[in-house]
């Protein structure tokens, strides 16, 4: 995640990023909407890797928890919202079937708008 | 990616998402800033999987290519910018060493602001 502040810029929504291990994640939602268990270890050629995920979400302590920064408030209501993407992970479904599935993880914080209705 | 439009909302920045294969991606940048080759297939317990990535970027054809939607233009300049995250991928570095590395992929389109200076 390149930091806009380094270029003298501000984000419309403040976010936080962190590394999360499968040990802490435990479960996730797959592409079909089912809950799956995220396995801690991935077998690789002759060994194991820890499953790690880089997650980004809206900063609940940030300035923008009340609404997005820089919005024209006369015409718009705004809200910072965490959005998700898909990454492949080694998982186990409810029937104990282990396999590589795409799971949803938090990857961004974006601003959504709704038009202000006339009073 | 949940669709804000379904809830009568608009995004400050328009984005497009697509599935990209390693065959199309070919190379990527790893966490240390080095360019690596993304391998097309990943060996799994019963064969091989194609490496796929779910990528989201700013829509170059969208309304927001000239600036973000809903911004207070009296005080702010704005720009929609594609941001990146990290996902693990099977890659080969410049020394032909194959391994699982975190690579950067496009995951979102966010709005960045700069303050308008007094004329």
């Amino acid at each position: 995640h390149s930091d806009p502040a380094r270029r003298g810029e501000l984000s419309v929504c403040d976010s936080i990023s962190e590394w999360v291990t499968a040990a802490d994640k435990k479960t996730a939602v797959d592409m079909s909407g089912g809950t799956v268990t995220v396995l801690e270890k991935v077998p690789v050629s002759k060994g194991q890797l820890k499953q790690y995920f880089y997650e980004t979400k809206c900063n609940p302590m940030g300035y923008t928890k009340e609404g997005c920064r820089g919005i024209d408030k006369r015409h718009w209501n705004s809200q910072c919202r965490t959005t998700q993407s898909y990454v492949r992970a080694l998982t186990m479904d409810s029937k104990k079937r282990i396999g590589w599935r795409f799971i949803r993880i938090d990857t961004s914080c974006v601003c959504t708008l709704t038009i202000k209705r006339g009073r | 990616h949940s669709d804000p439009a379904r809830r009568g909302e608009l995004s400050v920045c328009d984005s497009i998402s697509e599935w990209v294969t390693a065959a199309d991606k070919k190379t990527a940048v790893d966490m240390s800033g080095g360019t690596v080759t993304v391998l097309e297939k990943v060996p799994v317990s019963k064969g091989q999987l194609k490496q796929y990535f779910y990528e989201t970027k700013c829509n170059p054809m969208g309304y927001t290519k000239e600036g973000c939607r809903g911004i207070d233009k009296r005080h702010w300049n704005s720009q929609c910018r594609t941001t990146q995250s990290y996902v693990r991928a099977l890659t080969m570095d410049s020394k032909k060493r194959i391994g699982w590395r975190f690579i950067r992929i496009d995951t979102s389109c966010v709005c960045t602001l700069t303050i308008k200076r007094g004329r």
Partner: antibody, heavy 119, light 108 residues
Framework: DVQLVESGGGVVRPGESLRLSCAAS????????MNWVRQAPGEGLEWVSA????????YYADSVKGRFTISRDNSKNTLYLQINSLRAEDTAVYYC????????????WGLGTLVTVSS | EIVLTQSPATLTVSPGERATLSCRAS??????LAWYQQKPGQAPRLLIY???TRATGIPARFSGSGSGTEFTLTISSLQSEDFAVYYC??????????FGGGTKVEIK
């Protein structure tokens, strides 16, 4: 700068307990799995225990299983090791070590705290 | 558990000479091996990970090679500050993580 400072060591009798602490600074503590590694006087390094970033996964060497408990308080940026039923063979310098994101090895170590078990 | 055997136990070398340290694994650890340096009274310091990648701030005279079961740490031209004990560590199969017994590099 990353800093890890252990405390809580001392001279104890066999069968007694101790709680070691490791105060971390200079990095986002919750993003890293943390480990304890010990070194008996004049001997090599022995891995003791590990804990995932948010505490969801804990791991122990067979030699300490059931007697040692690893924990962390991310709000205080502190790692702990509760040591019960101490034995003479537990005499060692106990190091707190930060696990890298790149793999399960240790990119930063504390200076250690000495635990001496003697009757 | 995977056993790592380091040899020699002690290596006596003159400053400016090349030092070659060996680490052998009881089974393949792929390239999942790290090397550390430890000086008396100090904590270990990461030198190499992934069998051959130098950690941040480590001088180019340190290099790692090997994969599978045979690994080598080479110090191309020993400086006075390089006299220390060196440990290898595997992270291919865990828990437990395991360390080698160490090689002490002494001044001739």
């Amino acid at each position: 700068d990353v800093q890890l400072v252990e405390s809580g060591g001392g001279v104890v009798r066999p069968g007694e307990s101790l709680r070691l602490s490791c105060a971390a600074s200079g990095f986002t503590f919750k993003n890293h799995d943390m480990n304890w590694v010990r070194q008996a006087p004049g001997e090599g390094l022995e891995w003791v225990s590990a804990i995932s970033g948010r505490g969801g996964g804990t791991y122990y060497a067979d030699s300490v299983k059931g007697r040692f408990t690893i924990s962390r308080d991310n709000s205080k940026n502190t790692l702990y090791l509760q040591i019960n039923s101490l034995r003479a063979e537990d005499t060692a310098v106990y190091y707190c070590a930060r696990e890298s994101i790149w793999g399960i090895f240790f990119d930063y170590w504390g200076l250690g705290t000495l635990v001496t078990v003697s009757s | 558990e995977i056993v790592l055997t380091q040899s020699p136990a002690t290596l006596t070398v003159s400053p400016g000479e090349r030092a070659t340290l060996s680490c052998r694994a009881s089974q393949s650890v792929s390239s999942n091996l790290a090397w550390y340096q430890q000086k008396p009274g100090q904590a270990p310091r990461l030198l190499i990970y992934g069998a051959s990648t130098r950690a941040t701030g480590i001088p180019a005279r340190f290099s790692g090679s090997g994969s599978g079961t045979e690994f080598t740490l080479t110090i191309s031209s020993l400086q006075s500050e390089d006299f220390a004990v060196y440990y290898c560590q595997q992270y291919n199969n865990w828990p437990p993580l395991t360390f080698g017994g160490g090689t002490k590099v002494e001044i001739k």
